[in-house]
């Protein structure tokens, strides 16, 4: 005869363990009984459990209550046990001895192996701002037994760095992912994959990068120079720009105050029915936490009663 | 995937025997157990005995010793359960299903059922 | 042999409702228990093994619990594919044993 088992038995943490022990033997041979015990050890080997076929299962004091036989019904063939509740440290190699009858006493070494699924967290960056150099954007770490593989799923061209630190029982893994900070990264995901045999599936965590920016300012409202004429209603400026954060508006007049009845609606001036008084330098400053930029335009309000153009300068400055 | 194929109905008379089949398929046959088991007309469910497909040792529930014999075909990946001295008691709904006890898994619940076989005892 | 009783044999619910079924052992099964669903069809499937752990491919609403000899199934949330007859069964100790079925109908 001969016993059958497996080289290797692979269980999560916290799953129960069955490790395999079976005797092929030939017709009319018996199992008298089958010891149990971890093989690895430092200080010899330590028993585990001791099924006898006329006296049933003793499982040593250092495993009361994690070890059991099969549940019924039984093959007297089968000296398999169920080690409950599997932890890190039951992690080694174990044997089986088995006494039968007539054939004598067999023995077979298994590996139990427990694998520790990773909790992977992820840990954004510094700020980005458009204009940096190479930044990082995010870390990743993940430990677990044995090491997880850490990797990036992104639209987003950018550089990996990772690596690994080893303790007693497990392994810690850090991935790095940096990049060169621009607008159109904004809003973009950032999925840290963690993958690892102790996994159904795949672990994500999705960063969404925010990359700061300050686009230049521009007004517009002044096309059509010959709208610009007294009397004329509903005249407008509005003022152009986008920025992460989003930037707010503030409209000041560069050679005085703004006139009376002019309303300032966010990044829009609207004007009331307009007279010569409104002609001026007029200034956008547009800001956020990352920059500022200023527009200024200059308004030249038509009088018919005048024979003279309407001349319309515009001025850009940072 | 896992299959149990079972006849749907014998008819046989009483005193004679009948041997009703269990086909698997879409797994390692001789790697699970194969239960079997009886349900009456509008009854519940009774567990006859099972074989260890791996080396035919078999398992049976005391009142359906002498009834019950349950035997393998490995070539075929078949199960077999023969009823003897059949009486109107024995008319039934029978049952195969498979067993997790394997190298590697717990035998815990029956996973995999056959959708049964009628037997009828009547003359 | 261990005597498996489902005291209710039948039970009428209404879809979306929370439906317990109980089941007792005559002796303490160290929570070798299990729940099969057998559809009107005659099909026969394993819902719940060892108590409480669910079968691959059972639908969550489904969940065991129970120790020693005390042991129930609930359905969170009926749905008219639950319509069908739950059996527990025993597997502590030979020969295995199952309930007399609980007939589970929509009102």
């Known amino acids: 005869g001969e016993l059958e088992t497996s080289d290797v038995v692979t269980v999560v943490l916290g799953q129960d363990a069955k490790l395999p022990c079976f005797y092929r033997g030939d017709s009319g041979e018996q199992v008298g009984q089958v010891a149990w015990a971890r093989a690895d050890a430092g200080e010899g080997a330590q028993e585990l459990a001791l099924l006898h076929s006329k006296y049933g299962l003793h499982v040593s004091p250092a495993y009361e209550g994690r070890v059991e036989q099969p549940p019924p019904p039984r093959n007297p063939l089968d000296g398999s046990v169920l080690l409950r509740n599997a932890v890190q440290a039951d992690e080694g190699e174990y044997e089986c001895r088995v006494s039968t009858f007539p054939a004598g006493s067999f023995q077979a070494r298994l590996r139990l192996r427990v694998l520790v699924p990773p909790l992977p967290s992820l840990n954004p960056g510094p700020a980005l701002e458009e204009g940096q150099g190479l930044t990082l954007a995010a870390s990743c770490t993940a430990e677990g037994s044995p090491a997880p593989s850490v990797t990036w799923d992104t639209e987003v061209k950018g550089t990996t760095s990772s690596r690994s630190f080893k303790h007693s029982r497990s392994a810690a893994v850090t991935s790095e992912f940096h990049l060169v900070p621009s607008r159109s990264m904004n809003g973009q995901p950032l999925t840290c994959v963690v993958s690892h045999p102790g996994l159904l599936q795949d672990q994500r965590i999705t960063h969404i990068l925010h990359v700061s920016f300050l686009a230049e300012a521009s007004v517009r409202g002044l096309e059509d120079q010959n709208l610009w004429h007294v009397g004329r209603e509903g005249a407008m400026l509005k003022c152009l720009s986008e920025g992460q954060p989003p930037p707010s508006y503030n409209w000041t007049r560069l050679d005085g105050p703004l006139p009376s009845g002019v309303r300032v609606d966010g990044d829009t001036l609207g004007f009331p029915p307009l007279t010569t008084e409104h002609s001026g330098i007029y200034v956008c400053h547009v800001s956020n936490e990352f920059s500022s930029r200023d527009s200024q335009v200059t308004v030249d309000v038509l009088d018919p009663q005048e024979d003279s153009g309407k001349q319309v300068d515009l001025v850009s400055a940072s | 995937q896992v299959q149990l194929q079972q006849p749907g109905a014998e008819l046989v008379m009483p005193g004679a025997s009948v041997k009703m089949s269990c086909k698997a398929s879409g797994y390692t046959f001789t790697d699970y157990w194969m239960h079997w088991v009886k349900q009456r007309p509008g009854q519940g469910l009774e567990w006859i005995g099972a074989?260890?497909?791996?080396?035919?040792?078999?398992s049976y529930n005391q009142k359906f010793k002498g009834k019950a014999t349950l035997t393998v075909d490995e070539s075929s990946s078949t199960a077999y359960m023969q009823l003897s001295s059949l009486t109107s008691e024995d008319s039934a709904v029978y049952y195969c299903?498979?067993?997790?006890?394997?190298?590697?898994?717990w035998g815990y619940g029956m996973d995999n059922w056959g959708q049964g076989t009628s037997v009828t005892v009547s003359s | 042999d261990i005597q498996m009783t489902q005291t209710t044999s039948s039970l009428s619910a209404s879809l979306g409702d929370r439906v317990t079924i109980s089941c007792r052992a005559s002796q303490d099964i160290n929570n070798y228990l299990n729940w099969y669903q057998q559809k009107p069809d005659g099909t026969v499937k394993l819902l719940i093994y060892y108590t409480s752990r669910l079968h691959s491919g059972v639908p969550s609403r489904f969940s065991g619990s129970g120790s020693g000899t005390d042991y129930s199934l609930t359905i969170s949330n009926l749905e008219q594919e639950d319509i069908a007859t739950y059996f527990c069964q025993q597997g502590n100790t030979l020969p295995w044993t199952f309930g007399g079925g609980t007939k589970l109908e929509i009102k």
């Open positions: 074989i260890d497909t791996s080396d035919s040792y078999t």
């Open positions: 299903a498979r067993w997790g006890s394997t190298m590697i898994t």
